[in-house]
């Protein structure tokens, strides 16, 4: 892409952060080997990536979690990549589901989501999971990002 | 991207190769339906992708493996995408973990890693796994690549 | 990428669709929050993405499925990203394999495939699975796309 001032690169990669909040929305931080190309993409409230320019973006998330079938609800672990555009309802862009492991005390699994989507100026994307307490925050295990085409 | 001579496309996609080496670093080859856009990215020693230009890269790896819980250590199978920059220590960019399957003789699982990272000239990226003997080298199962934004 | 008329963005993201066909090739639709940048990439017969311009493309697919080890064949669930170029045989670009879950009635798992490949004008890519009846078509679970570098 290597673009001029009129057309700068826009990309972000943020790192998961454990949170005491009881929300299902994952929390992220600009820490470790993170990427934030410029102010045309920002991390807001530690929970969503917000873009200033309209266009096509490749958006991705990776979530590693540790769960046990007996200790979890019957429903699988689901990670959802969601979109909130100004003046619109939230919508799901991508989801992945993994049934809990039978391993004791818990079995680790990794989920990867990614796709190309049109974003409007001011649009935000975020990641929801069924149980944030099961998410692994060790180096490199859980991350979230985007790049503008 | 479709760039001029000043700003050529830089991309690579290499294919896994079985190796007699006892190292945990996976081996790759320019074989099958591989991609190597030009000499601004190279595969060195069959183990790492090295870039000549600084910039933002989307880097990815996919690893398919076959393992059994009883025959493996208690630790899960972990695939790590690692970075070695000139004059710096190695660091982990991304990791994924999957608990071993209870299927006999082994259960296959696939891991996908991907993210956007800033690379310096001469930086190399490589893939580490906990047990290379479990990795699947059948057509398309295990691969590694990058593209410059 | 943000390109001029000579060099427009080319990208697609299509959504899985349940099908009564007995073929192992997954079916897709331009529905929901899909992307189809222009007529330089098209969805043909609901099954393949076809490009008009030669070049390097990042191609990806995500498949979520629900299966049970006892009710399935011994072979794992395999998702394959395949290429059909004009005048050439089909070939496998990427594959992922997941052993069926022991969960009852079935255990959900998600597979993600992605890589950079050179496509010729008129080339088509499609996704094959071992058992289409096991694929999850709920919002966001199964999708397929590409972007031109």
């Amino acid at each position: 892409m290597q673009k001029g001032d009129q057309n700068p690169q826009i990309a972000a990669h943020v790192i998961s952060e454990a949170s005491s909040k009881t929300t299902s929305v994952l929390q992220w931080a600009e820490k470790g080997y993170y990427t934030m190309s410029n102010n045309l993409v920002t991390l807001e409230n530690g929970k969503q990536l917000t873009v200033k320019r309209q266009g096509l973006y490749y958006i991705y998330a990776q979530v590693t979690f540790c769960s046990n079938r007996e200790a979890s609800s019957q429903a699988p672990f689901i990670a959802s990549l969601c979109l909130k555009s100004p003046g619109r309802f939230e919508r799901i862009l991508l989801r992945a589901a993994n049934t809990h492991s039978s391993a004791k005390p818990c079995g680790q699994q990794s989920i990867h989501l990614g796709g190309v989507f049109e974003l409007q100026p001011g649009a935000s994307v975020f990641v929801n999971v069924t149980d944030p307490s099961q998410v692994s925050h060790g180096t490199g295990f859980t991350s979230f990002g985007l790049l503008k085409l | 991207m479709q760039k001029g001579d000043q700003n050529p496309q830089i991309a690579a996609h290499v294919i896994s190769e079985a190796s007699s080496k006892t190292t945990s670093v996976l081996q790759w080859a320019e074989k099958g339906y591989y991609t190597m856009s030009n000499n601004l990215v190279t595969l060195e020693n069959g183990k790492q992708l090295t870039v000549k230009r600084q910039g933002l890269y989307y880097i990815y790896a996919q690893v398919t493996f076959c393992s059994n819980r009883e025959a493996s250590s208690q630790a899960p199978f972990i695939a790590s995408l690692c970075l070695k920059s000139p004059g710096r220590f190695e660091r982990i960019l991304l990791r994924a973990a999957n608990t071993h399957s209870s299927a006999k003789p082994c259960g296959q699982q696939s891991i996908h890693l991907g993210g956007v990272f800033e690379l310096q000239p001469g930086a190399s990226v490589f893939v580490n796994v906990t047990d290379p003997s479990q990795v699947s080298h059948g057509t398309g199962f295990t691969s590694f690549g990058l593209l410059k934004l | 990428m943000q390109k001029g008329d000579q060099n427009p963005q080319i990208a697609a993201h299509v959504i899985s669709e349940a099908s009564s066909k007995t073929t192992s090739v997954l079916q897709w639709a331009e529905k929901g929050y899909y992307t189809m940048s222009n007529n330089l990439v098209t969805l043909e017969n609901g099954k393949q993405l076809t490009v008009k311009r030669q070049g390097l493309y990042y191609i990806y697919a995500q498949v979520t499925f629900c299966s049970n080890r006892e009710a399935s064949s011994q072979a794992p669930f395999i998702a394959s990203l395949c290429l059909k170029s004009p005048g050439r045989f089909e070939r496998i670009l990427l594959r992922a394999a997941n052993t069926h879950s022991s969960a009852k009635p079935c255990g959900q798992q998600s597979i993600h495939l992605g890589g950079v490949f050179e496509l010729q004008p008129g080339a088509s890519v499609f996704v094959n699975v071992t058992d289409p009846s096991q694929v999850s078509h709920g919002t966001g679970f199964t999708s397929f796309g590409l972007l031109k570098l």
């Epitope: - | 896994s16 079985a18 190796s19 007699s20 076959c66 393992s67 059994n68 009883e70 025959a71 003789p105 082994c106 047990d131 290379p132 003997s133 479990q134 990795v135 699947s136 080298h137 059948g138 295990t142 | -």
Partner: nanobody, 115 residues
């Protein structure tokens, strides 16, 4: 290309013994396991036993205590010692191995247990 060749099958009386061998040939870089499956007429292929590269061995309940798996890593060969054979052990026995990052199968050897 790596190949697996089984030998040692044949006709044996109930209560008798046989020793099957599975030899891997070709350039072998890595081995995760070698093992045995069997398929009786009209039935699905079933797993019997596996020996892993770390020496761990596992058996299906139907053969536990009667069959013993072993491996000679220097020869890339696995063995299945079958004792106290029963008519229901009659099947084609297949060697299977995870070699060089792929699941390999032999052609099979027929074991018939009959008086």
């Amino acid at each position: 290309e790596v190949q697996l060749v089984e030998s040692g099958g044949g006709l044996v009386q109930p209560g008798g013994s046989l020793r099957l061998s599975c030899a891997a040939s070709g350039r072998i870089f890595s081995t995760y396991f070698m093992g045995w499956f069997r398929q009786a007429p009209g039935k699905e292929r079933e797993w019997i036993s596996t020996v892993y590269s770390n020496g761990h061995t596992y058996y299906a309940d139907s053969v536990k205590g009667r069959f013993t798996i072993s491996a000679d890593n220097s020869k890339n060969t696995a063995y299945l010692q079958m004792n106290s054979l029963k008519p229901e052990d009659t099947a084609v026995y297949y060697c299977a191995a995870w070699l060089n990052g792929g699941n390999r199968w032999g052609q099979g050897t027929l074991v018939t247990v009959s008086s």
